[in-house]
């Protein structure tokens, strides 16, 4: 299958998201809350491999003097804005006393700007991608991922945080959007719909896909997520659309097969390490990119979004498992956990390939309406 006016190459996919959780000191997970496989301290200790980011948080990276590359997560919740025709009605929300940013839900009160003023910002995510209006930018080189192939041990933490399923990623997963634009992966999570109802966050010419994966990254220029929030390029999210294909996706099955264990909100399990890059499309060269925000409170802006042109294929059964297994708070199913698309407000989406050129025979004179802003890079 192809994206509307987009080319899909090979079915693979992956994603993560720290964007779905607000940051704040109050939300730092405690050691007691989150037992995890970590490096013990000591003479032979390997620095920085021990602290895993916590489930509902974006990790903070400790200074090298303490532990090289060590990550801990701080809670980043998610919010929903009204107005989407397929707006989610699910009640997923977190209610932590003293933490306003954790009290929100999809498709209802409180209004997200009340949870976090940034949610009313001008440059929010997700957005509708219109390939014909995207600016072809040859300077956008293929993404580079390093260290995403993980051995089965130590295991990784998979958690139902009430608004998504999130896999906490260990230190050492490096991603480069280009020269000098280097990031470390923190976590990945998914967004989905319900039976017969698609649930991707981004859309393409108004078309919503069954689901979407987000892999959330922190710029290496910052030691902690809270330092990077709101800073241009401080966070970067790789996003890929998931759609139905004829075969089971073996990479996703390693996670989906464990969802029953974490059906209850707040529950978690340990899963063997896996090839995280196998959750993503195989074509790292064709993508759309724009600057937006976290798609949940605190909705911090300055997030670089990279949306793959190629989709990831999952079987119908796998997509059903994703949308029909987890529960949120208040005995409500965890479904339709996506935010409505937000206005571009003058932003231009860039493409790493000539997306505006329709390869179909009907397109006589394709027009590229916007030019690349980064042409001189």
């Amino acid at each position: 299958q192809r994206l509307p006016r987009m080319q899909e190459d090979s079915p693979l996919g992956g994603g993560s998201s720290g964007e779905d959780d607000p940051l704040g000191e109050e939300d730092l997970p405690s050691e007691e809350d989150s037992p995890r496989e970590e490096d013990p301290p000591g003479e032979e200790d390997l620095p920085g491999e021990e602290d895993l980011p916590g489930e509902e948080d974006l990790p903070e990276v400790k200074p090298k003097s303490e532990e090289e590359g060590s990550l801990k997560l701080e809670d980043l919740p998610t919010v929903e804005a009204p107005g989407d025709p397929q707006e989610p009605q699910n009640n997923a929300h977190r209610d932590k006393e003293g933490d306003d940013q954790s009290h929100w839900r999809y498709g209802g009160d409180p209004p997200w700007p009340r949870v976090s003023p940034a949610c009313a910002g001008r440059f929010q995510s997700p957005v509708d991608i219109r390939p014909q209006l995207a600016a072809f930018c040859p300077a956008l080189r293929p993404l580079e991922l390093l260290g995403f192939q993980l051995p089965p041990l130590p295991e990784l933490r998979l958690r139902n945080n009430g608004h998504s399923v999130q896999l906490t990623l260990p230190p050492g997963l490096e991603m480069a959007l280009g020269p000098g634009r280097e990031y470390r992966a923190l976590q990945l999570h998914l967004h989905w719909g319900a039976a017969g109802r698609p649930g991707s966050e981004h859309t393409v010419e108004g078309h919503r896909f069954p689901a979407e994966i987000h892999v959330v990254h922190l710029s290496t220029a910052f030691a902690r997520v809270d330092e990077a929030l709101g800073r241009p390029g401080g966070l970067a999210v790789l996003a890929a659309f998931l759609e139905e294909g004829p075969e089971e996706n073996s990479a996703y099955e390693q996670l989906l097969s464990r969802l029953e264990e974490i059906a209850e909100e707040g529950s978690e399990t340990q899963v063997p390490g896996l090839d995280i890059s196998a959750l993503l499309p195989s074509d790292f060269s064709r993508y759309f990119q724009y600057e937006g925000s976290l798609t949940t409170p605190p909705c911090a802006q300055g997030v670089i979004w990279t949306v793959f042109n190629q989709t990831v294929m999952l079987s119908a059964k796998q997509l059903h498992t994703l949308s029909d297994t987890l529960w949120g708070p208040g005995d409500s199913r965890l479904q339709l956990n996506f935010r409505a698309t937000q206005p571009l407000n003058g932003r231009v989406i860039e493409a790493s390939f000539p997306a505006g050129v329709d390869s179909s025979p009907r397109a006589a004179e394709p027009v590229q309406l916007n030019s690349c802003l980064a042409a001189g890079d």
Epitope: P35, P40, E44, E49, G147, P152, L153, G172, D275
Partner: antibody, heavy 119, light 110 residues
Framework: QVQLVQSGGGLVRPGGSLRLSCAAS????????MSWVRQAPGKGLEWVSA????????YYADSVKGRFTISRDNSKNTLYLQMNSLRAEDTAVYYC????????????WGQGTTVTVSS | QSVLTQPPSVSGAPGQRITISCTGS?????????VHWYQQVPGKAPKVVIY???NRPSGVPDRFSGSKSGASASLAITGLQTEDEADYYC??????????FGGGTKVTVL
């Protein structure tokens, strides 16, 4: 002080059994995956078996599959290797090691215990 | 026969730079799994000197460095010192669900 203290090695006849123990201290043992690695006399290192932090998942080298069993008792901070149907080629120094490094390295090692299989 | 291939021995004079190679395959190093290096002094347990291809644990001199390219990796020791005399092993993970080691390289300081 972070350490792994091993015990249980010794001389055993072919076909016999032995149980090795590895007591951990100085770190939250129950949060870490663990492995056994062995080294035959004058030879290199060979990974033998591994176990997840909660003990729910185990892995074995083909050479010991069906004969060795790895287990752990997190309440006692102890790792075990039950070795049955021992063969002469199992003669080696056995090390327990911590699989805590997310890049896949073994970062903490026990002092080693010698297992000799001979008639 | 070890899954990862290392030279049996490497030697150098004090102050020299030596490198130890480690060659794997598409099911281990070439599959993207990291390479780690251990130093083992006779009669002692191994000790990590490089993890994750090129990271040095605290306490390991910066004379030790690692690199990886494709299905191969290498360990370099610059400014070789007498205390560096030991056996060195590379290690990775293999898709066959096993952790794998190289056969070891004996480093001699002349």
């Amino acid at each position: 002080q972070v350490q792994l203290v091993q015990s249980g090695g010794g001389l055993v006849r072919p076909g016999g059994s032995l149980r090795l123990s590895c007591a951990a201290s100085g770190f939250p043992f129950s949060s870490y995956a663990m492995s056994w690695v062995r080294q035959a006399p004058g030879k290199g290192l060979e990974w033998v078996s591994a176990i997840s932090a909660n003990g729910g998942t185990t892995y074995y080298a083909d050479s010991v599959k069906g004969r060795f069993t790895i287990s752990r008792d997190n309440s006692k901070n102890t790792l075990y290797l039950q070795m049955n149907s021992l063969r002469a080629e199992d003669t080696a120094v056995y090390y327990c090691a911590n699989n805590g490094n997310y890049r896949g390295a073994f970062d903490i090692w026990g002092q080693g215990t010698t297992v000799t299989v001979s008639s | 026969q070890s899954v990862l291939t290392q030279p049996p021995s490497v030697s150098g004079a004090p102050g020299q730079r030596i490198t130890i190679s480690c060659t794997g395959s598409s099911s281990n190093i070439g599959a993207g799994y990291d390479v780690h290096w251990y130093q083992q002094v006779p009669g002692k347990a191994p000790k990590v000197v490089i993890y994750g291809n090129n990271n040095r644990p605290s306490g390991v001199p910066d004379r030790f460095s690692g690199s990886k390219s494709g299905a191969s990796a290498s360990l370099a020791i610059t400014g070789l010192q007498t205390e560096d005399e030991a056996d060195y092993y590379c290690q990775s993970y293999d898709k066959s669900l096993t952790w794998v080691f190289g056969g070891g390289t004996k480093v001699t300081v002349l």
